[in-house]
Amino acid sequence: MKVLQEPTCVSDYMSISTCEWKMGGPTNCSAELRLLYQLVFQSSETHTCVPENNGGVGCVCHLLMDDVVSMDNYTLDLWAGQQLLWKGSFKPSEHVKPRAPGNLTVHTNVSDTVLLTWSNPYPPDNYLYNDLTYAVNIWNENDLADSRIHNVTYLKPTLRIPASTLKSGISYRARVRAWAQHYNTTWSEWSPSTKWYNSYREPFEQR
């Protein structure tokens, strides 16, 4: 049994880190492999993650962690029974992928404006809470070429767009993702999309 692609891990900088790797051939990850992880600290326990399959040769493990701080470092050992396949380490603060924003809602009852709101995925005491910026993707359900990205670089998780910038009588979808500039993170996954109907009509004189 051989590791083809070594484990790479990302942290949500809160409580979960996700590690993925590829094996040299088809593998029943949960039956054959165990990923052991331990915070490098004198009295820390070694926890065991039972991986799950991620494609034919891919495996994925979710590591449950304490509230992450910048100096945290974990040792990782990938075992197949009593055989050590790979040994490595992981510093969560250096490989951050934020959680996806949630509760994306579209408010169309404000005249001439489409208001999008969503929730910051972190509690206020988390370091990432005040460091997130967002990208909002809006697209026309009937014309995928009619798609745009709005960058939200302020802290408030809201976006206002004039309804007139969208085609009238068309259904649109939106989704949002986040990243944290000061932590040099990757983008989060996109939030689930939400759909609305743009019923805005231009005033008669402008038609």
Epitope: S43, T46, T48
Partner: antibody
């Protein structure tokens, strides 16, 4: 330094109740590990009672014999874990240890306690009339 | 799950090689730990995951086995090693943790 201190033991009559406390210091009781109770009757071996996951999920596991009479709970704000013991019998007389445990997880919702790494000094419970 | 530990007691001399065994009633992979306990004290973790030495434990202690059969070995018994030893098996099918009945190691003679 990480430490566990048990309290609440003492003499109780058969059929009575008692609540034991375990105060954690040097680490957060709400972090990623299990907190457990283990007991040892005088001159006898060790017997696992129950565990509670210290994170937000708070999932619990009990020894089959402990279900119903014993309840494990936690108060993260006080860094404390409790063991509520009801309908006590003479055979419940023992030193009760609090212990921190590692875990095995599959995904983020299936987590179960593994070995006990850090132990308190124990508190003696005597059930007698 | 049941854990059968043997022997229940043994007498040995300083410098002796001591072996204690533990058998699980079902396959527990490598989810086995060994503890040392002295009178009036809480147990002390020696080995976890069947063969991994806990922090600060002398290298004369070693563990082996997987599945159902496990062994704790003390390669050269020291005066401070006279104590009672327990195995602990963990079953993830039930989430239960079961201790062996213990092995008391006493001074020969």
């Amino acid at each position: 330094e990480s430490q566990l201190v048990e309290s609440g033991g003492g003499l109780v009559q058969p059929g009575g109740s008692l609540r034991l406390s375990c105060a954690a210091s040097g680490f957060s009781s709400s972090s990623a590990h299990y907190m457990c109770w283990v007991r040892q009757a005088p001159g006898k071996g060790l017997e696992w009672i129950a565990c509670i996951y210290a994170g937000s999920r708070g999932s619990t596991y009990y020894a089959s014999w402990a279900k119903g009479r014993f309840t494990i709970s936690k108060d993260n704000s006080k860094n404390t874990v409790y063991l509520q013991m009801n309908s006590l019998r003479a055979e419940d007389t023992a030193v009760y240890f609090c212990a921190r445990a590692a875990f095995v997880n599959r995904g983020v919702s299936w987590i179960w306690p593994y070995y006990f790494s850090l132990w308190g000094q124990g508190t003696l419970v005597t059930v007698s009339s | 799950i049941q854990m059968t530990q043997s022997p229940s007691s043994l007498s040995a001399s300083v410098g002796d090689r001591v072996t204690i065994t533990c058998q699980a009633s079902e396959d527990i992979e490598s989810y086995l730990a060994w503890y040392q306990q002295k009178p009036g004290k809480p147990p002390k973790l020696l080995i976890y995951r069947a063969s991994t030495l806990a922090y600060g434990v002398p290298s004369r202690f070693s563990g082996s086995g997987s599945g159902t059969d496990f062994t704790l070995t003390i390669s050269s018994l020291q005066p401070e090693d006279f104590a009672t030893y327990y195995c602990l098996g963990s079953s993830y099918s039930t989430g239960s943790n079961i201790f062996g009945t213990g092995t008391k190691v006493t001074v020969l003679g």
